[in-house]
Amino acid sequence: TQNKALPENIKYGIVLDAGSSHTSLYIYKWPAEKENDTGVVHQVEECRVKGPGISKYVQKVNEIGIYLTDCMERAREVIPRSQHQETPVYLGATAGMRLLRMESEELADRVLDVVERSLSNYPFDFQGARIITGQEEGAYGWITINYLLGKFSQKTRWFSIVPYETNNQETFGALDLGGASTQITFVPQNQTTESPDNALQFRLYGKDYNVYTHSFLCYGKDQALWQKLAKDIQVASNEILRDPCFHPGYKKVVNVSDLYKTPCTKRFEMTLPFQQFEIQGIGNYQQCHQSVLELFNTSYCPYSQCAFNGIFLPPLQGDFGAFSAFYFVMNFLNLTSEKVSQEKVTEMMKKFCSQPWEEIKTSYAGVKEKYLSEYCFSGTYILSLLLQGYHFTADSWEHIHFIGKIQGSDAGWTLGYMLNLTNMIPAEQPLSTPLSHSTYV
């Protein structure tokens, strides 16, 4: 017989990440005969759904179907028709929906019900919509980056896939920042944990992993900003809030009802003598940093060591991949380079925050003002969270790698979620027979 390539049997999977600020649809593909190998699944498409997160549709659920249409139609185009019926579709909702569920389980269920009905109308194998836990979000993010970095592979490669990949099998920790929550997940040096709530055990590809994880609800960048505003308005003498986290010359009116809408601001809620207040930016990094630090309660710790708010955190260990908003924000600020020290990042932030709003608008004319106005806060928040929240130091800063994609796949929880639900991460190392992956006859 001739060495003729057989047509590859390709499988597809779809995961929708229903985040607090938006929904993204990811399409993954892999060779069917290699589905238990590590690193064979890769992302072929990301489609960002136009509009806010699904939790914002609670009063207009009849619009959910239309909201999801474009990206689902895109999936219909990308995936060959012959594969539609066997392509699983999963939707995982994160902290935005966790917060809605805290306010009203009935309303959260209504949104999920309509989402499920809408998605079931497509010709795929719809596997349901659910709110994933913070622990799952952390764990699946950790699985994703280590899967993509080849950390579960027993084959040592003589080449390096990505600049920060080392050939050792030490896993990377995962730092995930969303709009409403943030997760930290890593394998600590010490296998015994003081807090069982934060402990996960995995057996992946024949190896045991004892993983620490925690998800801080309300400490995503958007909810952290609402918290900070609610805290600071308490001590404002009138309806003007001079805010160091916004550029000099920036002005914005905020409704008090919007401020207190989220459960994240409940601890700061008080009766104010006004319905609205105006943020006036003064652009001072140091003051902004101080204000942000007040969101982290570090005075109480029932363990040997804590992050903040009395949550156990073991000593940091190894390299960390920081993704999602950690990456988006730092990438916008041009601070993702491995060569930029923590001191340099702080310097750059000071400079950026002090730039006048008019100047910023001119320099970044293509960026939506709503997002543009918040980069000073977000950058400051990221530094505060990593340094004071998680106890990274100037030295350990170089172990943080700001990652957008690995091998063309977005870093985030979605790939890990799909790998788990499709049983593509075996507990034991698959036996690789010499001819098992041959595509030639």
Epitope: V61, I64, E106, V114, E116, R117
Partner: antibody, heavy 121, light 107 residues
């Protein structure tokens, strides 16, 4: 106690359409989903689709996509199921049934009496 | 879609005896499973939901058990009015799917 009352039996020609109604009485209508299930003579139950009358949101079994349309009229507490391009295999009793809950709670706790649809040339 | 398989197709039982009906799902449905009874010329009637909770007005002789992929409907002591066809249905995911039914007939 909620009751679902369906329209009467129909005899239809192949290629035509049929529209069956289901009127709810004696309870709240809009907050529940209404499913349509059919049963061919001597066969089992087959789910066709569902609607939340309050929002007009419908979803359908893939088998019937493009051929079935489920609608609701809140003012009369009536749900409709229209099946087009009828063929002899569509001869069946068509039931409407109330879904008792919301998210992942689609047990069917109240059923209509059924509507016999015969497709014959 | 989730495929529901019922066994046996027909069950011959004497009045007063116990009847055990099985239902298997092609993937886990948790406890999102219902059982229905249907008599000739009538609409189905909900007996059990949540795999084991009896619906309003259903006699205690009907009981459901199981979770995940394996479910059982037990009729502890068959009465004459219990001879009928029984269907299981999963309601975890769309499309809602029914088993093929088990006919319980008089032995």
């Amino acid at each position: 106690q909620v009751q679902l009352v369906q329209s009467g039996a129909e005899v239809k020609k192949p290629g035509s359409s049929v529209k069956v109604s289901c009127k709810a009485s004696g309870g709240t209508f809009e907050s529940y989903g209404i499913s349509w299930v059919r049963q061919a003579p001597g066969q089992g139950l087959e789910w066709m689709g569902s609607i939340i009358p309050e929002f007009g949101i419908a979803n359908y079994a893939q088998k019937f996509q493009g051929r079935v349309t489920i609608t609701a009229d809140e003012s009369t507490s009536t749900t409709y199921m229209e099946l087009s391009s009828l063929r002899s295999e569509d001869t069946a009793v068509y039931y409407c049934a109330r879904e008792s809950g919301g998210y992942r709670d689609h047990r069917l706790d109240v059923w209509g009496q059924g509507t016999m649809v015969t497709v014959s040339s | 879609e989730i495929v529901m398989t019922q066994s046996p197709a027909t069950l011959s039982v004497s009045p007063g005896e116990r009847a055990t009906l099985s239902c298997r799902a092609s993937q886990s449905v948790g406890s999102n499973l219902a059982w229905y009874q249907q008599k000739p010329g009538q609409a189905p009637r909900l007996l059990i939901y949540g795999a084991s909770t009896r619906a309003t007005g259903i006699p205690a002789r009907f009981s459901g058990s199981g979770s995940g992929t394996e479910f059982t409907l037990t009729i502890s002591s068959l009465q004459s009015e219990d001879f009928a066809v029984y269907y299981c249905q999963q309601y975890l995911l769309w499309p809602l799917t029914f088993g093929g039914g088990t006919k319980v007939e008089i032995k």
